[in-house]
């Protein structure tokens, strides 16, 4: 019962986590304009992994996709890759874990097979969560570096009365969503791995068999042979994911009245 609960909870937590990773990856607020000196601004800038947006005080928002692939910073590309790998692994993990759930009966699937699948999905969730946390952390580090660089250069090029204030960017909501989601996926994965230990058959009991030989009557009683879980040996058909990662440049979305608080 506890195993089923642990497995089920692990699955639900991972599902929420992966949904969060997908949400974070799609969100536009990875970095937002720093409003420390000016809490009310007429033009507010924010950027995501796929496009950058400008919200005007008039309420209009204009977003532009990053039309280039090669012209983008390597760090941004790395973050994109980490998040996509995290989503792909998480999605496969979810698919595997559905079939591994103890509460779901699929034909005459043995407990050892379910244990293997639970462990596989658990590992996938752990790696998925780590990818998301790594991706978000890399982006956050990039922001911190750029923040202090732009702070140092903030009033450079000041000629007479004319000021050129550089726009500084700080952590956006997507970073926090990503960290939390990555953490949840990681926790879900650990729970699946824990559940897997309980799913593995602990003991194989053999029924007593009587052999009647001439002159002797010997009864062989059941012995306490430990069952071999053999996680590595009895993996049958490993699923191979053909990613075919498509990169789609977003078309410019025309300015639209955007609900904002």
């Amino acid at each position: 019962m506890a195993v089923t609960a642990c497995q089920g909870l692990g699955f639900v937590v991972s599902l929420i986590g992966i949904a969060g990773i997908i949400a974070a990856t799609c969100m536009d607020q990875w970095s937002t304009q720093d409003l420390y000196n000016n809490p009310v601004t007429a033009v507010f800038n924010y950027q995501g992994l796929w496009r950058s947006c400008v919200r005007e005080s008039s309420g209009f928002t204009e977003c532009r996709g990053y039309f280039t692939l090669l012209g983008l910073p390597a760090m941004l590309q790395a973050v994109r890759a980490l998040m996509i790998v995290g989503i792909v692994l998480g999605a496969i993990g979810l698919l595997v874990s559905i079939f591994a759930l103890k509460c779901i009966r699929i034909g005459s699937m043995e407990d050892s097979a379910k244990a293997n699948m639970t462990l596989t999905s658990g590992i996938m969730f752990i790696v998925s969560g780590l990818c998301a946390i790594a991706g978000v952390s890399v982006f956050a580090n990039m922001l911190v570096t750029n923040f202090w660089m732009s702070t140092a250069n903030m009033y450079t090029g000041m000629g007479g009365m004319v000021q050129t204030v550089q726009t500084r960017y700080t952590f956006g909501a997507a970073l926090f969503v990503g960290w939390v989601a990555g953490g949840l996926t990681l926790i879900g994965g650990v729970m699946m791995c824990i559940a897997c230990r309980g799913l593995a058959p602990e003991e194989t009991n053999y029924k007593a068999v009587s052999y009647h030989a001439s002159g002797h009557s010997v009864a062989y009683k059941p012995g306490g042979f430990k069952a071999s879980t053999g996680f590595g040996s009895n993996t049958k058909n490993k699923k191979i994911y053909d990613g075919g990662a498509r990169t789609e440049d977003e078309v410019q979305s025309y300015p639209s009245k955007h609900d904002y608080v």
Epitope: A42, V43, Q47
Partner: antibody, heavy 118, light 113 residues
Framework: EFQLQQSGPELEKPGASVKISCKTS????????MNWVKQSNGQSLEWIGH????????TYNQKFRGKATLTVDKSSSTAYMQLKSLTSEDSAVYYC???????????WGQGTTLTVSS | DIVMTQSPSSLTVTAGEKVTMSCKSS????????????LTWYQQKPGQPPKLLIY???TRESGVPDRFTGSGSGTDFTLTISSVQAEDLAVYYC?????????FGSGTKLEIK
């Protein structure tokens, strides 16, 4: 057709308060911010502030904070500006204007002339 | 507050002539996020409210004749009327739309000989 119809001219005594209205038609009132602009005796223009009719959030020019209060009535698609503790300095033409792309003002009311005199 | 300085304060030209007026801001009006300059030009004819001519420094409002052209970036902006018509008699204002409070220039009065 878009229209911003402002209330008629006002003659007020110093120390009094006045409420100017701006009735809109022809567009979604809550979809666009409403700005208020002051023009003293044919001189330059001064931005007083704006209001987002959807969230009823306001942003004021520091100079007019405490002097002007911006409100809206969504049911009648009307924006209001109340000016209090009037002095002769407040004598001017007041315009309401709708926000557009680039924070520009694309449609303007015809203006309300306020005269403060004892 | 951003200070907007317009020059000249008044201008007298003959119909058909090309005219340029300048507007300078005390701070850059360029937004790196969308590569746009938040400067607007208005035309105010006597006894009328101002009329939007150009926003984002160079984008002409629909219905505005193409003889009106806005240019410039950062802190220096120009409004050009390629061939002045009698109906262009007005005061022209530039406005900072980049940061609060929105501020206007003192205006350039265009008179026709």
């Amino acid at each position: 057709e878009f229209q911003l119809q402002q209330s008629g001219p006002e003659l007020e005594k110093p120390g009094a308060s006045v409420k100017i209205s701006c009735k809109t038609s022809g567009y979604s009132f809550t979809g666009y911010n409403m700005n208020w602009v002051k023009q003293s005796n044919g001189q330059s223009l001064e931005w007083i502030g704006h209001i987002d009719p959807y969230y009823v959030t306001t942003t004021y020019n520091q100079k007019f904070r405490g002097k002007a209060t911006l409100t809206v009535d969504k049911s009648s698609s009307t924006a209001y500006m109340q000016l209090k503790s009037l002095t002769s300095e407040d004598s001017a033409v007041y315009y309401c204007a709708r926000s557009f792309y680039g924070n520009a003002f694309d449609y303007w009311g015809q203006g309300t002339t306020l005269t403060v005199s004892s | 507050d951003i200070v907007m300085t317009q020059s000249p304060s008044s201008l007298t030209v003959t119909a058909g002539e090309k005219v340029t007026m300048s507007c300078k801001s005390s701070q850059s009006l360029f937004n790196s996020g969308n590569q746009k300059n938040y400067l607007t030009w208005y035309q105010q004819k006597p006894g009328q409210p101002p009329k939007l001519l150009i926003y984002w420094a160079s984008t002409r409002e629909s219905g505005v004749p193409d003889r009106f052209t806005g240019s410039g970036s950062g802190t220096d902006f120009t409004l050009t009327i390629s061939s002045v018509q009698a109906e262009d008699l007005a005061v022209y204002y530039c406005q900072n739309d980049y940061s609060f409070p929105f501020t206007f220039g003192s205006g350039t009065k265009l008179e026709i000989k």
